[in-house]
């Protein structure tokens, strides 16, 4: 048979951050190539990454069409020199991925503190509204556009001279916090989607401290 040395893909894994979504699998091909198909539960299969020797396929363009849908992918294995060959059952070997719902499962990317401004004993901290690859009307949507009030940010802030981290939360991209006059503070933010059960938190933003470039101080 032409598929004697063809092996099915395995360990199919979705890797997704802020909706940039790649399907990965094993093994590295030896004398075989792969084609990926993706569909929604009720939709038709669409082929991607035709006859590739890679073990990953960028499916972002497909999943951003509707991030709230649940997707299934499958990876077909073909002999390298004879992609028309089929397995013993009359079709190529393939393996299904786990189901993937981008809105519920994409990892939240590391946020960035855009700026902070102190006015007296108040500090306004602004989080950058990161752009995603989700489009509406030919415009790329921000993370806030996609998730709305489902997305909150947790701010950790502390005096430069101490270790205890106070917290504040917002469902916008801005915090207004009280600080002690004459004290320097450091800040870090974390994106959170509380309604999720998995992938609820992002990694923390880089720490920004008062007295450094991003801040402004006004009496």
């Amino acid at each position: 048979s032409g598929t004697t040395n063809t092996v099915a893909a395995y360990n199919l894994t979705w890797k997704s951050t802020n909706f940039k979504t790649i399907l990965e699998w094993e093994p590295k091909p030896v004398n075989q190539v792969y084609t990926v198909q993706i569909s929604t539960k009720s939709g038709d299969w669409k082929s991607k990454c035709f006859y590739t020797t890679d073990t990953e396929c960028d499916l972002t363009d497909e999943i951003v069409k509707d991030v709230k849908q649940t997707y299934l992918a499958r990876v077909f294995s073909y002999p390298a020199g004879n992609v028309e060959s089929t397995g013993s059952a009359g079709e190529p070997l393939y393996e299904n991925s786990p189901e993937f719902t981008p809105y519920l499962e994409t990892n939240l990317g590391q946020p960035t503190i855009q700026s902070f401004e102190q006015v007296g004993t108040k500090v306004n901290v602004t989080v950058e509204d990161e752009r995603t690859l989700v489009r509406r009307n030919n415009t790329f949507l921000s993370l806030r556009d996609v998730f709305g009030k489902d997305l909150i940010y947790t701010l950790y802030y502390w005096k430069s001279s101490s270790s205890g981290k106070k917290t504040a939360k917002t469902n916008t991209n801005e915090f207004l916090i009280d600080v002690d006059k004459g004290e320097n503070y450091c800040f870090s933010v974390q994106a959170v989607i509380p309604s999720r059960t998995v992938n609820r938190k992002s990694t923390d933003s880089p720490v920004e401290c008062m007295g450094q470039e991003k801040g402004e101080f006004r009496e």
Partner: antibody, heavy 120, light 107 residues
Framework: EVQLVESGGGLVQPGGSLRLSCAAS????????IHWVRQAPGKGLEWVGY????????YYADSVKGRFTISADTSKNTAYLQMNSLRAEDTAVYYC?????????????WGQGTLVTVSS | DIQMTQSPSSLSASVGDRVTITCRAS??????VAWYQQKPGKAPKLLIY???FLYSGVPSRFSGSRSGTDFTLTISSLQPEDFATYYC?????????FGQGTKVEIK
């Protein structure tokens, strides 16, 4: 089912140490925040401190700062409260609680509590 | 730190009575206030979150409201299982703080 189970309480002399455990099941602690709250006999609830197990960040009530340390082992899905230099006024039932972490909901699940008695 | 001043500290009531407990925050806490019920020897249980939202599984006779920095827990018709101690808590800022508690006893 979400569950928190505290253990490690007991009788300890003033100046002594004790480590309480809070074993979580039904959820992953690194995706939430864990707080410790205590209640002295016949008294109200007093917040002790919190940890974000994801990054290790903590904050403590002034009454325990420098004496108590909260930590977490995400591989065991367990949070800890290390109590040093214990005083009679630390005698209380100690509860761990899960912080849902939203703007609207804070401590949604609590453990059953473990009694710590500081006495000579 | 934000103080949560709860009143009364105790009250006596009969089954079927309407009961009101109040909590005043020392500064703005938005709606970040929860109410808990605690029975002797048991852990507190969440009743109301975000000042006025009933937590899952809590009977509808419990309700919460907010007016500025004043927060109210109301039990519309007290039941035998409602005799307990009730606490308010703000989680608007760190550290979170609790009210002193209100013990609801049988008249």
């Amino acid at each position: 089912e979400v569950q928190l189970v505290e253990s490690g309480g007991g009788l300890v002399q003033p100046g002594g140490s004790l480590r309480l455990s809070c074993a979580a099941s039904g959820f992953t602690i690194s995706q939430y925040w864990i707080h410790w709250v205590r209640q002295a006999p016949g008294k109200g609830l007093e917040w002790v401190g919190y940890i974000d197990p994801y990054n290790g960040y903590t904050y403590y009530a002034d009454s325990v700062k420098g004496r108590f340390t909260i930590s977490a082992d995400t591989s065991k899905n367990t949070a800890y409260l290390q109590m040093n230099s214990l005083r009679a006024e630390d005698t209380a039932v100690y509860y761990c609680a899960r912080d849902y972490g939203s703007l609207r909901v804070s401590l949604d699940y609590w453990g059953q509590g473990t009694l710590v008695t500081v006495s000579s | 730190d934000i103080q949560m001043t709860q009143s009364p500290s105790s009250l006596s009531a009969s089954v079927g009575d309407r009961v009101t407990i109040t909590c005043r925050a020392s500064q703005d806490v938005n709606t970040a206030v929860a109410w808990y019920q605690q029975k002797p020897g048991k852990a507190p249980k969440l009743l109301i979150y975000s000042a006025s939202f009933l937590y899952s599984g809590v009977p509808s006779r419990f309700s919460g409201s907010r007016s500025g920095t004043d927060f109210t827990l109301t039990i519309s018709s007290l039941q035998p299982e409602d005799f307990a101690t009730y606490y308010c808590q703000q989680h608007y800022t760190t550290p979170p703080t609790f009210g002193q508690g209100t013990k609801v006893e049988i008249k």
